[in-house]
Interface confidence: medium
């Protein structure tokens, strides 16, 4: 059974899931970014269903083309390299969906944006941090 | 190898419709933008359009919006253009191409395969 | 839609000679241009995209440059296998569009 101290630290994981995946959506929709009608033309995939934390399997599989997407923006836009950025975003993925089970993601027919593909994440880390407090 | 191969040559009448077609092989085909060019006789390129098939989202230039359209069959890997009535004035080279990218996935950037092309000819 | 320009219309030149090909756009296009060479009766051939970035595969005496509205295409040796019209293309905003052509020969 989950600890109360278990449950803050993931709580603690999931808020920093959180404010990565805003720091990213603020970056990208920076008015003066000339890139985003470029970045807006990737398509990305979304889990069919996503209500878990073994579900992060989806968000974890699509890092390797957010960091691509992400290299288009100015880096003036971020704090971070790209490369560092999901680097970490990738390290509290995996130690929030666990490593013990192997979990094969379902995909959505319907592909996405980047701005919709991070707003699905957020809204998803959201609704755990609600379940947790 | 990466290849788009077009349907043949056709010779229509005005007023008559057609679908031509470019099957994508070597690579997956719902993740890259195909984009339609026109070339008339002895002319340049035409940007006409551009479809994603694993949506299905397409993009066309004003010029050419309603005066064709772009579709695509991801299960068969095919894209098409088609005329519900055709012109003289369309007479034409055809390419289909393929948008290049990163991580197996593309988003606007250069064509960087191309159909063979698929000449037509509307003449009455 | 943005409007791209070419200029020469067409050139002669000898082999081993350094030809220049430039492209405007209309409006500033940051480096989102791509050059493509068409030999006759073949579909096109991408070189160079984002004004620069030469294509896997193409030979090193092609180079791009520029950025904003002003670009450069150059052939810095050229061969007699490289006669062919060369088209610059934007694809910084929808709809993409193309230069008229500069059509390359051999004098």
């Known amino acids: 059974a989950p600890t109360s101290s278990s449950t803050k630290k993931t709580q603690l994981q999931l808020e920093h899931l959180l404010l990565d995946l805003q720091m990213i959506l603020n970056g990208i929709n920076n008015y003066k970014n000339p890139k985003l009608t470029r970045m807006l033309t990737f398509k990305f995939y979304m889990p069919k269903k996503a209500t878990e934390l073994k579900h992060l399997q989806c968000l974890e599989e699509e890092l390797k083309p957010l960091e691509e997407v992400l290299n288009l923006a100015q880096s003036k836009n971020f704090h971070l390299r790209p490369r560092d950025l999901i680097s970490n975003i990738n390290v509290i993925v995996l130690e929030l969906k666990g490593s013990e089970t192997t979990f094969m993601c379902e995909y959505a027919d319907e592909t996405a944006t980047i701005v919709e593909f991070l707003n699905r994440w957020i809204t998803f880390c959201q609704s755990i941090i609600s379940t947790l407090t | 190898e990466v290849q788009l191969v077009q349907s043949g040559a056709e010779v229509k009448k005005p007023g008559e419709s057609l679908k031509i077609s470019c099957k994508g092989s070597?690579?997956?085909?719902?993740?890259?933008?195909i984009g339609w060019v026109r070339q008339m006789p002895g002319k340049g390129l035409e940007w006409m359009g551009i479809?994603?098939?694993?949506?299905?989202?397409?993009k066309y230039s004003p010029s050419f919006q309603g005066q064709v359209t772009i579709s695509a069959d991801k299960s068969i890997s095919t894209a098409y253009l088609q005329w519900s009535s055709l012109k003289a004035s369309d007479t034409a080279m055809y390419y289909c191409?393929?948008?290049?990218?990163?991580?197996?996935?593309?988003?606007?950037?250069?064509?960087?395969?191309w159909g063979q092309g698929t000449a037509v000819t509307v003449s009455s | 839609d943005i409007q791209m320009t070419q200029s020469p219309s067409s050139l002669s030149a000898s082999v081993g000679d350094r030809v220049t090909i430039t492209c405007q756009a209309s409006q500033d296009i940051s480096n989102y241009l791509n050059w493509y060479q068409q030999k006759p009766g073949k579909a096109p051939k991408f070189l160079i995209y984002?004004?620069?970035n030469l294509e896997t595969g193409v030979p090193s005496r092609f180079s791009g440059s520029g950025s904003g509205t002003d670009f450069f295409f150059t052939i810095s040796n050229l061969q007699p296998e490289d006669i062919a019209t060369y088209f610059c293309?934007?694809?910084?905003?929808?709809?993409?569009?193309f230069g008229p052509g500069t059509k390359v020969d051999i004098k």
């Open positions: 070597g690579y997956r085909f719902t993740n890259y933008w």
């Open positions: 293309q934007q694809d910084d905003n929808l709809p993409f569009t």
């Open positions: 479809i994603y098939p694993g949506d299905s989202d397409t």
């Open positions: 984002d004004a620069s």
């Open positions: 191409a393929r948008h290049g990218g990163y991580s197996g996935r593309s988003y606007y950037y250069g064509m960087d395969v």
